[in-house]
């Protein structure tokens, strides 16, 4: 058997001595007949240890026993052990008794074999077994006096090699994790949740984290369980970012050619039908009317221009009716309405003019009179020594209903180069400079523009009693919407409940998956802020997209181009959205085009304005933005201006 | 461009006649009245009248009823102002403008001084 | 006849001040007043128009307000050149008639 290093020398060095072992024997025999029988010498001392070492220790040693005990001669019992045990310098024993194994006698002098574990001279020292390889243990070295052992760390446990430790499987334990997902790890485990979730130790349940908390969102945050939305505000022009926390404005992807002349008038400007330009004539000299302009539209009504004094007097309205000119006139009270020539709402200059003659009044399309009535007066009228006229563009001066045949009074169009009286007109041409929202697009095509600014709104039923029904009322929203759009995010159609502030529903084009949290280009129908339906759209090709959403009673679909959309609810949830609609529904709702009033964020999927070309069909009828209830007054109701040619 | 140009200054004695022009061009002569305007020296304005340049017909204020003839020559887009008989409170500058109900366009005014 | 009480005839003024003239009318006229500047040896130049609308090509200083029988020309922060005389006229009846000016002096 082989011992460690340090217990074979504590072995060796004694063993050196043994040799000796009868020498010993015989040297105690000799002490006893010189020094024990008879009073001895350091000479004779000398001669019986044959050494000095063991002299020097012994005779002063032997004077204290001669002193203690009187000489040998005294024959005291206590002399001869006193003295017998001078030289065993085991006795009494020096060495630990704890630790020592044997005590060994030298030549004046002592060696104590140390039991395993204890070390030092006297052996009353512990030896770290743990300080060397860590005693051998795998994990933990626990030393102790005289000894050591192994232990592992939590979540293992020591072989029965007393050395090596074993991970404990906690997962065994079906309690471990409660509801949660357990994973064991090497000496643990762990209590796993879906991602937005934390695992609650004392509940030992996983527990929905409140991200919005943590303050992630940059505007407006939505805890949901396991996940949360942040929302930005889209009626203030911004979107979410890429990194679906942060806002960022939302950038027209399309360049559309806004450019305006500045030498033209805008007549669609005021939503409230009033004039854009209100002229006042007045005159000493009897003069007649004279008007002439260059005139472009594509919107087949509304009033180009009324001369004349107030509403009970004497005037003439020049208007579009079904795209062709008509000309409403009163004379000292008599109304009289006279409609002739082409259609001219094709969105092309032509010049139109107004003269009064002697007794008629003759109105010129490019030169060639449509239009020549016989009148008996004058539409200059003599007030205090002055004649006077009043002149507005784009509207007249009193109410539609006053006309003699009421007319939607607001009209999408275009003038330049006009002429009143013949006179050079130097106020309109200054202010109109220096106010783009008085002028017109350079280049116009059909349909409607939303510049992204604001919406406008009607109020439409959308219950319908069918007459083989009797009293049950049926419901359906369809919409077709063509769109060229210039922006990534927006509302195209919306109805909004005034009463309960909410968003019943919403067709929008939005530039990520709000559950996915991914950036994509997409449709969403809404029902309040779930979305039903997703389809997918290549929003900035500068192309015209046909969005078709058709929502009855049990369905709800969406179409982008033909192609249907992806549903996002189960047939459950389906018709539980529907069910919410249809409450709407029955309440008052306003319809919305291009946006959403000034709701919370969270109401729908978007709130943004929506920014391009659209022209609306609500259940098989064109929405015309001049008859809304209200439009903003830079969406321009029939016209829209070309996506800008790409640079060569 | 609309402009009315006036003839040049005139000394006159008391009791002599003085006929003042005013060429109007940029415009159809016929289609505004021709307003006559006086302003004493250190004095403010004063509206004297106007000429209707369709019929020639003339209307004068009553301060100016007698002595003072407003008439035209439309062959030459031209409205004329005489003063008959002078004085020396006719001693003023006169100005020619074209009738908007108001007055946008002036001649650079004549003065005529009557002095003995 | 429509008579015109133009106040005051004259007043000082440093370039900066805020001047205002007023004129006062014998009856109610709308809002038919117009106003002229005129410096020495010029013919007047038209300010406002009716319906106190400010006229092309004169700086936004100068501003009409009133109706009725009270009106006032305001300039705002006045300039060198503004020093001149002014005038008021009304355009309401036959015969039109002018007030009696007021000189705006250097102070």
């Known amino acids: 058997a082989l011992l460690p290093a340090r217990e074979a020398t504590q072995f060796l060095r004694p063993r050196q001595r043994r040799a000796f072992q009868v020498f010993e024997e015989a040297k105690q025999g000799h002490l006893e007949r010189e020094c024990v029988e008879e009073l001895c010498s350091r000479e004779e001392a000398r001669e019986v240890f044959e050494n000095d070492p063991e002299t020097d220790y012994f005779y002063p040693r032997y004077l204290d026993c001669i002193n203690k005990y009187g000489s040998p001669y005294t024959k005291n019992s206590g002399f001869a052990t006193c003295v017998q045990n001078l030289p065993d310098q085991c006795t009494p024993n020096p060495c630990d008794r704890k630790g020592t194994q044997a005590c060994q006698d030298l030549m004046g002098n002592f060696f104590c074999l140390c039991k395993a574990g204890w070390g030092g001279r006297l052996c009353d020292k512990d030896v770290n077994e743990c300080s060397q390889e860590n005693g051998g243990c795998l994990q933990i070295c626990h030393n102790k006096p005289g000894s050591f052992h192994c232990s592992c760390h939590s979540g293992f446990e020591l072989s029965s090699d007393g050395r090596t430790c074993q991970d404990i499987d906690e997962c065994a334990d079906s309690e471990a994790c409660g509801e949660a997902r357990c994973k064991n790890l090497p000496g643990s485990y762990s209590c796993l949740c879906d991602e937005g979730f934390a695992y609650s130790s004392q509940e030992k349940a996983c527990r929905d984290v409140d991200e919005c908390l943590q303050g992630r969102c940059e505007q407006v945050c939505v805890n949901s369980p396991g996940s949360y939305t942040c929302h930005c505000d889209g009626r203030g022009g911004l979107k979410l970012s890429q990194d679906m926390d942060t806002c960022e404005d939302i950038l027209p992807c399309v360049p559309f050619s806004v450019a305006k002349s500045v030498k033209s008038l805008y007549l669609g400007r005021m939503f409230s039908g009033t004039p854009v330009i209100r002229l006042r004539f007045k005159r000493l000299q009897p003069t007649r009317l004279v008007a002439e302009f260059d005139f472009r539209t594509f919107d087949p009504e509304g009033i180009l221009l009324f001369a004349g004094g107030h509403q009970d007097s004497t005037w003439i309205v020049l208007a579009l009716r079904a795209g062709r000119l008509e000309l409403q006139l009163r004379y000292n009270g008599v109304g009289r309405v006279t409609s002739s020539g082409p259609v001219i709402n094709h969105g092309m200059w032509q010049t139109i003019s107004v003269e009064e003659l002697a007794r008629n009044l003759v109105i010129k399309v490019n030169r060639d009179a449509v239009m020549k009535i016989a009148v008996a007066g004058d539409l200059f009228q003599p007030e205090r020594g002055l004649y006077h006229l009043n002149l507005t563009v784009g509207g007249i001066p009193f109410h539609e209903k006053d006309l003699v045949q009421p007319i939607n009074p607001r009209l999408d169009g275009c003038m330049r180069s006009w002429n009143w009286l013949n006179g050079e007109d130097t106020t309109i041409q200054e202010t109109v400079k220096v106010n783009t929202r008085m002028q017109c697009f350079s280049v116009t095509e059909r349909g409607s523009f939303y510049p992204g600014s604001g919406f406008a709104f009607y109020s439409l039923d959308y219950m319908r009693t069918p007459l083989d029904v009797g009293t049950e009322s049926t419901w359906e929203v369809e919409v077709v919407a063509h769109i060229r759009p210039a922006a990534d995010t927006g509302v195209l159609f919306a109805l909004w409940a005034p009463d309960l502030r909410a968003v019943p529903l919403s067709v929008a084009l939005v530039d990520y998956h709000s559950t996915k949290k991914l950036k994509k280009q997409l449709v969403v129908l809404a029902v309040e802020h779930t979305a039903l339906a997703l389809m997918e759209i290549k929003v900035c090709d500068g192309q015209e997209h046909v969005v078709t959403v058709s929502l009855r009673d049990g369905e709800a679909t969406l179409e982008v181009d033909g192609t249907r959309g992806q549903s996002e609810v189960s047939a459950a949830q389906l018709q539980e959205r529907l069910a919410v609609l249809e409450r709407h529904l029955r309440s008052p709702v306003l319809t919305f085009a291009g946006g959403l009033p000034d709701v919370p964020v969270t109401s729908a999927p978007v709130t943004a304005f929506y920014r391009g070309c659209m022209t609306l069909e609500v259940n098989r009828r064109l929405l015309d933005l001049d008859e809304a209830a209200y439009k903003h007054s830079d969406i321009t109701a029939h016209s829209c201006p070309p996506v800008e040619p790409a640079a060569a | 461009q609309v402009h009315l140009v006036q003839s040049g200054s005139e000394l006159k004695k008391p009791g002599a006649s003085v006929k003042i022009s005013c060429k109007a061009s940029?415009?159809?002569?016929?289609?505004?009245?021709m307003n006559w305007v006086r302003q004493a020296p250190g004095q403010g304005l004063e509206w004297m009248g106007w000429i209707n340049t369709n019929t020639g017909e003339p209307t004068y204020t009553e301060e100016f009823k007698g002595r003072f003839v407003f008439s035209l020559d439309t062959s030459v887009t031209t409205s004329y102002l005489q003063i008959s008989t002078l004085k020396a409170e006719d001693t003023a500058v006169y100005f020619c403008?074209?009738?908007?109900?108001?007055?946008?366009?002036w001649g650079q005014g004549t003065l005529v001084t009557v002095s003995s | 006849e429509t008579t015109l009480t133009q106040s005051p005839s004259s007043l000082s003024a440093s370039t900066g001040d805020r001047v205002t003239i007023t004129c006062i009318t014998s009856t109610d006229i709308d809002d038919d007043m117009n106003w002229y500047q005129q410096k020495p040896g010029k013919a007047p130049k038209l300010l406002i128009s009716e319906g106190n609308t400010l006229r092309p090509g004169v700086p936004s200083r100068f501003s009409g307000s009133g109706s009725g029988t009270d009106f006032t020309l305001t300039i705002s922060s006045t300039q060198p050149e503004d020093f001149a005389d002014y005038y008021c006229l009304q355009t309401d009846s036959v015969p039109l008639t002018f007030g009696q000016g007021t000189k705006v002096e250097i102070k």
């Open positions: 940029g415009y159809t002569f016929t289609n505004y009245g």
């Open positions: 403008a074209r009738d908007e109900g108001w007055f946008v366009y």
